[in-house]
Amino acid sequence: LRPSRVYKPEGNTKRALTLKDILNGTFSYKTYFPNWISEQEYLHQSEDDNIVFYNIETRESYIILSNSTMKSVNATDYGLSPDRQFVYLESDYSKLWRYSYTATYYIYDLQNGEFVRGYELPRPIQYLCWSPVGSKLAYVYQNNIYLKQRPGDPPFQITYTGRENRIFNGIPDWVYEEEMLATKYALWWSPDGKFLAYVEFNDSDIPIIAYSYYGDGQYPRTINIPYPKAGAKNPVVRVFIVDTTYPHHVGPMEVPVPEMIASSDYYFSWLTWVSSERVCLQWLKRVQNVSVLSICDFREDWHAWECPKNQEHVEESRTGWAGGFFVSTPAFSQDATSYYKIFSDKDGYKHIHYIKDTVENAIQITSGKWEAIYIFRVTQDSLFYSSNEFEGYPGRRNIYRISIGNSPPSKKCVTCHLRKERCQYYTASFSYKAKYYALVCYGPGLPISTLHDGRTDQEIQVLEENKELENSLRNIQLPKVEIKKLKDGGLTFWYKMILPPQFDRSKKYPLLIQVYGGPCSQSVKSVFAVNWITYLASKEGIVIALVDGRGTAFQGDKFLHAVYRKLGVYEVEDQLTAVRKFIEMGFIDEERIAIWGWSYGGYVSSLALASGTGLFKCGIAVAPVSSWEYYASIYSERFMGLPTKDDNLEHYKNSTVMARAEYFRNVDYLLIHGTADDNVHFQNSAQIAKALVNAQVDFQAMWYSDQNHGISSGRSQNHLYTHMTHFLKQCFSLSD
């Protein structure tokens, strides 16, 4: 038996983090996003649940909806109608999948100071929203869309085809929600509130994933979800637009699919209203390297939507898949014809392009060996976007303004020099025409949210600076965080290293690799975090490293598309390369190296443990994918193609965790999964376990009954992190 080693942070009155701190969320931070209601007015929900109105210019603020009104219906969220006459209050939140939930809605009349009675909304509602003008309501109930011209009016039923687990109107099915739209809704109002566009998803032919939900009853329930795995039948999508002024006169009108898309299996990817009678739809071939953006116009004479061929713009990737994780969406100019869009330039870096007529004639707006990440707002004279250009760090985000009114356009970094040490990772929230905006800084220092003048970029006010958190961290020994790069051959890998307090390079420390590594992800980010790995470094003296290997995002397509059609190879190889480099640094105890990951990270950590290199003593996989055939079609096929003999079946088979079962013999492996995981099905871990048993390989396992992919219920989460901590400490011979 190896003697136990205890890490003792020396000579300091500050205390180390405890696991309890992490599990209690003691050191969580706050952000402040204004809910803009005009150019200079916004709403915000206060700590004590009052809804407060603010006018930046007059400095007025007052409560528009008291917490007692909120409490009277147990409301947790709200939404003001654009005409400001009504507020919906949301209560009985009941989570479904990642974004979707059902809720009960009440409408409050601000003038009368009472709830609207008569024709009350049904419950539970799957989605509800105001029109962009006035106070029309659209909502989805039992997979059908309904419309109310006013909150007190009777509802008008727009669709009748809705059926549980078969046909979804205005809300996505499981796979579209998770892998394509990343929203709980699939309906969009036109800017003037005249038209309502929506998607119908037909899941009638999709195979069902069924799993037990144990609950408290004598018999478990079975959860059934239409879930297309790789190569399976996919949802059939149709897009409709209905005139909400006269919904009973003319029914919903279908928007035609571009010919080059409709010729084989395809996806709808997004919808953007351009003007009151112009809409932009994006489509994607099932083989996701061709995307088509189609601009359609309302033809009053035909009472139809026309999408001329000369308004189709094709985006194609020759080295991988179209877009990043998703295909980017267009940001239209005020002429309602030209638009700005992020896609790969000739060097394979994602940059902003200006499209006036054809994609071929696109004008490149940004360029360089860095990537434009998101276009926030296009106004008459400015375009605001985020990128990782500044100082060449891919894991930073700064906000830039391009003055498009000027010729040539001039570029200014709005955030680069504001709080240089504290803030290197920003997002922003703009008022309608960017007269004002809020900046939300996520780190690396304590997060801070500030309000700015959109003309001068002057800071007007600090909205949230996390003073309480700053005070409570004063007596905590936090680890030191470094973000650096390492080179291997012609490749550069960025890594984040979390070093124990009083780190001494002349000593040896255990190393834990935390990995995600999924295509188009990024783990090495300049953000603030106090989480489980922070505790492991602070209290247990473990060095933590996160490495962004090939396949990760924002470093160009050569790096991103390296993993195309061969998942599970380079992601693992690059983690191993990094570990070898870390050993060369001289402060890592080679006998005590572990790896852990969740989801895609569980897949990579499993394959790394089974790499046969002898680098790892132990590792943990939480909710891992074990075969790409078990995962969702849209995701798996985007990166792997189809699991068919004439496409990529061979690599689908080669890249499973089960194929490497024998190689787990010389490592300590902890396998963890929630039994009610709707996303990465328990099947994945069941198959790993079966393969390990068949190979007579010993391993440890833990399941979490009725927990989903997040294993997020309080008790389960506590148990999970406590269990993983014990496992790691045992592996590293650290006493409890």
């Epitope: 150019e39 200079q40 109105f53 006018n55 007059t58 003001l80 400001r84 009349d109 601000l110």
Partner: nanobody, 116 residues
Framework: DVQLVESGGGLVQVGGSLRLSCVAS????????MSWVRQAPGKGLEWVAS????????YYADSVRGRFTISRDNAKNTLYLQMNSLKSEDTAVYYC?????????VNQGTQVTVSS
């Protein structure tokens, strides 16, 4: 001291037109979302129309949409309501309000009477 002075009301035939004005003082008019509201005899306050501070966006009650137009001149600190195709149910005292949201606080107003 905040002051809102409405004018332009009067007696008009069904189908006729009127233009109401509201002159503001004592506050930075150009920074405020402004509204017109009305009170018919024996009824509560009813919202009519609103306009953004920069005049860019306007909202109307269903009962007046297409007939009334709200506008503003920030240089003159004045809010307007152009009322066309007037109906007898438009008879009310009309007030302008600087409250960004209901409930509205109103002053003296201007009487509009639509007779058939």
């Amino acid at each position: 001291d905040v002051q809102l002075v409405e004018s332009g009301g009067g007696l008009v035939q069904v189908g006729g037109s009127l233009r109401l004005s509201c002159v503001a003082s004592g506050f930075t008019f150009s920074s405020y979302y402004m509204s017109w509201v009305r009170q018919a005899p024996g009824k509560g306050l009813e919202w009519v129309a609103s306009i953004y501070a920069d005049g860019d966006m306007t909202y109307y009650a269903d009962s007046v949409r297409g007939r009334f137009t709200i506008s503003r001149d920030n240089a003159k600190n004045t809010l307007y309501l152009q009322m066309n195709s007037l109906k007898s149910e438009d008879t009310a005292v009309y007030y302008c309000a600087k409250d960004p949201l209901p409930p509205y606080h109103v002053n003296q107003g201007t009487q509009v009477t639509v007779s058939s």
